[in-house]
């Protein structure tokens, strides 16, 4: 079976790499124009140059194309915790990332925010924070993870998944709570 | 205490229009980010959009994008999303959230609004 390809991929594919068919003339391979320019006119003939120019400020091409416009440049989100880690240039986009001690946590392949790395109070590193993923802790005893903190077994409640981490505590709260009892 | 109510769902046909409305209480509205996020039959939560406290430079999930809008009006506490040309995979009830601040999960979201989109 042979995959289907889409119209541009079928034009490109007839001609060799670093080039594309003439969108009027399928017997003419243009030459591609190179990252950071856009195709501001199509090869007149074959051998000729194509006519590519540069990005304008605000825009970029990260790769050689023959697009009729330049990408824009992406914004880092404030409200998302976002920091500018690099600006665009016209054959890169802005790179966006998070402060010291922050990781990104993403909610869609292209949306991020960031949050701060868990200290893990009441507990130790069991793996350090990293770019893509919170610090992992392990409780001390006495302590159960709820939302990657440590929280006193005093918090737990019997429907809570903590009842077996806790399990001990829970029982010593129950017999003092029987004890009392007359 | 903080109450999101969400409404304006219901059933509609392929191609056609609804606008979800969310009356926030309990904190100051006008400071917080606004989301809107959604669960179809079955499915994870979906991050459709949200709008920064002054209303500038929305986002939208690429599935959304140029089909539904996100406002918000701050003096009536309100978030809307207007959805246009809808399909049948916008099928979900969708609810409005405060953007997360302490870490990956939702504190305060609504019980959510259903929308069918019937093909």
């Known amino acids: 079976l042979v995959p289907h390809l889409g119209d541009r991929e079928k034009r490109d594919s007839v001609c060799p790499q670093g080039k594309y068919i003439h969108p009027q003339n399928n017997s003419i391979c243009c030459t591609k124009c190179h990252k950071g320019t856009y195709l501001y006119n199509d090869c007149p003939g074959p051998g000729q140059d194509t006519d590519c120019r540069e990005c304008e400020s605000g825009s970029f091409t990260a790769s050689e194309n023959h697009l009729r416009h330049c990408l824009s440049c992406s914004k880092c989100r404030k409200e998302m915790g976002q920091v500018e880690i690099s600006s665009c240039t016209v054959d890169r986009d802005t790179v966006c990332g998070c402060r010291k001690n922050q990781y990104r946590h993403y909610w869609s392949e292209n949306l991020f925010q960031c949050f701060n790395c868990s200290l893990c109070l009441n507990g130790t590193v069991h793996l350090s924070c990293q770019e893509k993923q919170n610090t992992v802790c392990t409780c001390h005893a006495g302590f159960f993870l709820r939302e990657n903190e440590c929280v006193s077994c005093s918090n737990c409640k019997k429907s809570l998944e903590c009842t077996k981490l806790c399990l001990p505590q829970i029982e010593n709260v129950k017999g003092t709570e029987d004890s009392g009892t007359t | 205490e903080v109450q999101l109510l969400e409404s304006g769902g219901g059933l509609v046909q392929a191609g056609g229009s609804l606008r979800l409305s969310c009356a926030a209480s309990g904190f100051t509205f006008a400071h917080e980010t606004m989301v809107w996020v959604r669960q179809a039959p079955g499915k994870g939560l979906e991050w459709v959009s949200h709008i920064p406290p002054d209303g500038q430079d929305p986002f939208y999930a690429d599935s959304v994008k140029g089909r539904f809008t996100i406002s918000r009006d701050n003096s009536k506490n309100t978030l809307y999303l207007q959805m246009n040309s809808l399909r049948a995979e916008d099928t979900a009830v969708y609810s409005c959230?405060?953007?997360?601040?302490?870490?990956?999960?939702?504190?305060?979201w609504g019980q959510g609004t259903l929308v069918t989109v019937s093909s």
């Open positions: 959230a405060l953007l997360p601040k302490r870490g990956p999960w939702f504190d305060y």
